[in-house]
Interface confidence: medium
């Protein structure tokens, strides 16, 4: 019987070449985050938030992934291949496993943005 | 040193309600939860749920939520497991079992010597 | 509910020798970090005693000659060289979720 629920920024959308912030929220219990796991949609793990051991950023992603903010993570310099699903899983003591879900879609930059960002008045 | 104090039998009628006890001595009291187990004879332990002793909080077995109520007494230490309706099938010896935290991997690092439940008329 | 399958159900060692109890979990019980899997003995009248916490870590007071392995599904505790009061019932327990759940038990006889 297990209390609480994740909490998620849902469906989200970003451009190419920019960043984004995955962010999971556990609320209405009072277990005890030990440790918050980072997935991508194949399951390869971009990043552990350990409560004694702190952040690990496997290294895949090092470039790429930063930690924070709290609980959450930044995925910068995005590409066409980060579009799909993102996956926090939270261990908590004394619930066991709490997971949310983000959908991640990154968007093509128009001409017309770029062109209009570097237009010469 | 850490105690967990239960009395050795208790004799109850069926259907009449019982409330088992369980007295803690030896360490900080309110910074631990406390389970309880049923094993029956012959038979492995069924977990029937936990309480932390600062905030009453409660994780039930689904199959014991009809049947288990636990509550905590702050003042004396003291934690009960009441039993609705019982019958024979709730004759068992009952224990409860201190759980300690370790980063979320928790285990039960102390016993009491358990409560031999006898249902009968 | 995590399903916990041990095995053998009961077994029969010669005095000095190595007795070995498997645990199984329906899923997995281990993390990066950590593996959420205790082992127990209790004898007749008695409540269970902890032998080994997180897989492999043996509790204060227990005797070196248990030893505990595994991670993931798999997990094996090992007593060796027996002596005669390890005749007992040993069981497996996981912390992972709510609930908690044990295994079925290994009756252990010393010859």
């Known amino acids: 019987m297990m209390t609480g629920t994740i909490e998620t920024t849902g469906n989200i959308s970003a451009k190419k070449g920019g960043s984004v912030i995955l962010q999971c929220h556990l609320s209405s219990t009072m277990a005890q985050v030990t440790q918050v796991n980072w997935e991508q949609h194949d399951h390869s793990l971009l990043a552990i938030r350990n409560a004694e051991l702190g952040w690990h950023i496997y290294p895949a992603f090092k470039d790429r992934v930063a930690p924070g903010p709290g609980l959450g993570l930044t995925l910068q310099s995005l590409t066409m291949n980060d579009t799909g699903e993102y996956f926090c899983t939270y261990h908590t003591y004394p619930d066991g496993t709490y997971r949310g879900r983000i959908f991640l879609e990154v968007l093509e930059s128009s001409v017309a943005e770029h062109s209009a960002r570097f237009q010469i008045p | 040193q850490v105690q967990l104090q239960q009395p050795g039998a208790e004799l109850v009628r069926p259907g009449a309600s019982v409330k088992l006890s369980c007295k803690a001595s030896?360490?900080?009291?309110?910074?631990?939860?406390m389970n309880w187990v049923k094993q029956r004879p012959g038979q492995g332990h069924e977990w029937i749920g936990m309480?932390?002793?600062?905030?009453?909080?409660?994780r039930l077995n689904q199959n014991f939520l009809d049947k288990a109520t636990l509550t905590v007494d702050k003042s004396s230490s003291t934690v009960y497991l009441q039993l609705s309706s019982p019958t024979s099938e709730d004759s068992a010896v009952y224990y409860c079992?201190?759980?300690?935290?370790?980063?979320?991997?928790?285990?039960?690092?102390?016993w009491g010597q358990g409560t031999t439940l006898t249902v009968s008329s | 509910d995590i399903v916990m399958t041990q095995s053998p159900a009961s077994l029969v060692v010669s005095l000095g020798q190595r007795a070995t109890i498997s645990c199984r979990t329906s899923?997995?019980?281990?993390?990066?970090?950590?593996?959420?899997m205790h082992w127990y003995q209790q004898k007749p009248g008695q409540p269970p005693k902890l032998l080994i916490k997180?897989?492999?870590n043996l509790e204060s007071g227990v005797p070196a000659r248990f030893s505990a392995s595994g991670s993931g599904t798999d997990f094996t505790l090992n007593i060796h060289p027996v002596e005669e009061e390890d005749a007992a019932t040993y069981y497996c327990?996981?912390?992972?979720?709510?609930?908690?759940?044990f295994g079925g038990g290994t009756k252990l006889e010393i010859k």
């Open positions: 997180n897989a492999s």
């Open positions: 309480i932390h002793l600062s905030n009453s909080e409660t």
């Open positions: 327990q996981h912390s992972w979720e709510i609930p908690r759940t």
């Open positions: 030896g360490y900080s009291f309110t910074s631990y939860w």
């Open positions: 079992a201190r759980e300690r935290d370790y980063y979320g991997s928790s285990y039960f690092d102390y």
């Open positions: 899923q997995s019980v281990s993390t990066s970090s950590y593996s959420y």
